[in-house]
């Protein structure tokens, strides 16, 4: 299996009340805007054949599209959550810069591409679930990365 | 197929400690967070506590907070429930439970029987 | 007292659709994204049958669905069965990271 180096980050960052809070509710007022419930972008499809030493890896992946195709681009959305979520999840992508595979992470990066496939194919309404997704992508770095 | 088995449940005093075990086969199981949950005689259900797959992250009920603590052996595809300072109201039959998928912990989708703690003087 | 309000109980004659509502509690962060509905038959564990709002488990049957709305969530069985008759509790994954159940709803098929 391939090898993970600097996959972690630290329980202290999940260990803010006022930001895991905030980020809940910028997941909850998107997810509110989301007619179509019957997708999902975070869960058993994304994870599928990727072992959890490697999940780490894969949710940067994920929180890095996340930030740069959609939160971005809809930063003027969902205020006032958005101005302080977008900065700690950018935090967390940067504390995951030197997150690494060595080896092959051709599944990985399939399963990803999937995901951003979906995000893109809905247009708009793609983004506007991700956002949603917030909460799942939050505590699917917690899980995977400490 | 995917088992989940409790032990260590007994009687025990007000104040008195316990240690619940739940054996797990079937599947890879440091793949997946695990739970332990609770129901006492003729209510409802109660989540007590729940670990990550590495036990980096354990998180816990208020009502147990501080007097619980959970663990887990990966090597010997176990969990673990150490209870202390244990109080009437934690008499229940306490449940091992596994995520539906990996990743999901709070998904229950495998559960073991229980095994009963009840505490009384 | 549980975080999450579901009715005490419901009823309904065979072939009918009911439908069990779960919802938060003033002022809770809800993190919707997160129910999970469970089946629990006397003297048996529980069972899931619906997860991450409305997606349901391999081998659960396609008459049970789930939805939410604003902070209430929603579980839906259409064509009721003698065997549904259970109890049925809500639970959700919330911003401490605990996880909170309704305190359960007694389903009666007449």
């Known amino acids: 299996a391939p090898i993970s180096s600097h996959c972690r980050l630290d329980k202290s960052n999940f260990q803010q009340p006022y930001i895991t809070n905030r980020t809940f509710m910028l997941a909850k007022e998107a997810s509110l805007a989301d007619n179509n419930t019957d997708v999902r972008l975070i869960g058993e499809k994304l994870f599928h054949g990727v072992s959890m030493s490697e999940r780490c890896y894969l949710m940067k992946q994920v929180l890095n599209f996340t930030l740069e195709e959609v939160l971005f681009p809809q930063s003027d959305r969902f205020q006032p959550y958005m101005q302080e979520v977008v900065p700690f999840l950018a935090r967390l992508s940067n504390r995951l810069s030197t997150c690494h595979i060595e080896g092959d992470d051709l599944h990985i990066q399939r399963n990803v591409q999937k995901l951003k496939d979906t995000v893109k194919k809905l247009g708009e309404s793609g983004e506007i679930k991700a956002i949603g997704e917030l909460d799942l992508l939050f505590m699917s770095l917690r899980n995977a990365c400490i | 197929e995917v088992q989940l088995v409790e032990s260590g449940g007994g009687v025990v005093r007000p104040g008195g400690s316990l240690r619940l075990s739940c054996a797990a086969s079937?599947?890879?199981?440091?793949?997946?967070?695990m739970n332990w949950v609770r129901q006492a005689p003729g209510k409802g259900l109660e989540w007590v506590s729940g670990?990550?797959?590495?036990?980096?992250?354990?998180d816990y009920a208020a009502s147990v907070k501080g007097r619980f603590t959970i663990s887990r052996d990966n090597a010997k595809n176990s969990l673990y429930l150490q209870m202390n300072s244990l109080r009437a109201e934690d008499t229940a039959l306490y449940h091992c439970a596994r995520g539906w998928y990996s990743g999901a912990a709070w998904n229950m989708g495998y559960w073991g029987r229980g095994t009963l703690v009840t505490v009384s003087s | 007292q549980a975080a999450l309000t579901q009715p005490a109980s419901v009823s309904g004659s065979p072939g009918q659709s009911i439908t069990i509502s779960c919802t938060g509690a003033s002022g809770d962060v809800g993190a919707y994204n997160f129910v999970s509905w469970y089946q629990q038959h006397p003297g048996k564990a529980p069972k899931l049958i619906i997860y991450?709002?409305?997606k349901r488990p391999s081998g659960v049957s396609n008459r049970f669905s789930g939805s939410k709305s604003g902070n209430t969530a929603s579980l839906t069985i259409s064509g009721l069965q003698a065997e549904d008759e259970a109890d049925y509790y809500c639970a959700s994954l919330v911003s401490d990271f605990s996880v909170v159940f309704g305190g359960g709803t007694k389903l009666t098929v007449l």
């Open positions: 991450d709002v409305n």
């Open positions: 079937g599947f890879t199981f440091d793949d997946y967070g």
């Open positions: 670990v990550n797959w590495n036990g980096g992250t354990r």
